[in-house]
């Protein structure tokens, strides 16, 4: 993360400065919906654990075409130190249960905000 | 298998209106993004506007004001709109799908041409 | 909007050399560590054909001989070696902010 370069950023931006850019635009997607996220679309549920953004990129990056979630696909692509394509799954999803971008969105960032109380930047 | 076809009305007068369809096949306009591209003859791509599958529509700066996009996903199509022609319209326009993030235009339609003369 | 100019506009390679063209952004395409740079080929007649994304991405398909690099302003697409196959005009592409845009084109003729 400490190498994490943000949109108007020139150079790294601090991982505490991040996070909270990333807990900024789930929270933004989540009081700005109105009609279904993403129309409904449902991804593969993650362990909130080691490897939680590239897990929640590889789950997120299934969903195409949802202009609500550009910019978090985006910011955990930046997270992520691998390269992560649309089919690609690791063992750090729970893959008999899917649910709604909407509820997705919602429980990473109950655990981001979690994360961020507790100092857990990186 | 994935296809777009771009269909026009190949001659419009100057100062009229175009209107063309893309009928897609293989994947759902509600999950996909398509973009509208022309290229005058001889000359090289302009990216005009996009639908996002969600619906929001983003337009190129220049032509705002010209441009409506819109779509029916239920029947598979996606509409461009331009008004107030000029010659300089003249081209071949594209419709191109985004594939998946980082949202590359993965699938070209053929092209449908455009005349603006009278 | 971002400006991409594409250079040269054309240029000639003899078979089997390498042909490298670049395409400079009026400002960076980069967002949160990624360049959000693409490469096209059209061939004569044809729609164009997604080569490389994000900078330096193979698209699925896409021959080995074909590699994109850079950041921020510059980027270039290389090709090495050259086939007779590969003349045609290549665009780079830009989806850094919303207002999505193309370089003028290089084309590429094969000696």
């Known amino acids: 993360l400490t190498c994490l370069g943000g949109f108007a950023s020139p150079g790294p931006v601090p991982p505490s400065t991040a996070l909270r850019e990333l807990i900024e635009e789930l929270v933004n997607i989540t009081q700005n919906q109105k009609a279904p996220l993403c129309n409904g679309s449902m991804v593969w549920s993650i362990n909130l654990t080691a490897g939680m953004y590239c897990a929640a990129l590889e789950s997120l990056i299934n969903v195409s075409g949802c202009s609500a979630i550009e910019k978090t696909q985006r910011m955990l692509s930046g997270f992520c130190p691998h390269k992560v394509s649309a089919g690609q799954f690791s063992s750090l999803h729970v893959r008999d249960t899917k649910i709604e971008v909407a509820q997705f969105v919602k429980d990473l960032l109950l655990h981001l905000k979690k994360l961020f109380r507790e100092g857990q930047f990186n | 298998e994935v296809q777009l076809k771009e269909s026009g009305p190949g001659l419009v007068a100057p100062g009229g209106s175009l209107s063309i369809t893309c009928t897609v096949s293989g994947f759902s306009l509600t999950d996909s993004s398509i973009n509208w591209v022309r290229q005058p003859p001889g000359k090289g791509l302009e990216w005009l506007g996009m639908i996002w599958g969600d619906g929001r529509i983003d337009y190129a700066d220049a032509l705002k004001s010209r441009l409506s996009i819109s779509k029916d996903s239920s029947k598979s199509q996606v509409f461009l709109e331009m008004t107030s022609l000029r010659t300089d319209d003249t081209a071949t326009y594209y419709c191109a799908r985004d594939g998946y993030f980082p949202y590359a235009m993965d699938f070209w339609g053929q092209g449908t041409s455009v005349t603006v003369s009278s | 909007d971002i400006v991409l100019t594409q250079s040269p506009a054309s240029l000639a390679v003899s078979l089997g050399q390498r042909a490298t063209i670049s395409c400079r952004a009026s400002?960076?395409?980069?967002?949160?560590?990624?360049?959000?740079m693409h490469w096209y080929q059209q061939k004569a007649g044809q729609p164009p054909k997604l080569l490389i994304y994000l900078a330096s991405n193979l698209e699925s398909g896409v021959p080995a001989r074909f590699s994109g690099s850079g950041s921020r302003t510059d980027f270039t697409l290389t090709i090495d070696p050259v086939q007779a196959e590969d003349a045609a005009t290549y665009y780079c592409q830009q989806n850094a902010e919303d207002s999505r845009t193309f370089g003028g084109g290089t084309k590429l003729e094969i000696k």
């Open positions: 400002e960076s395409v980069d967002s949160y560590g990624q360049s959000y």
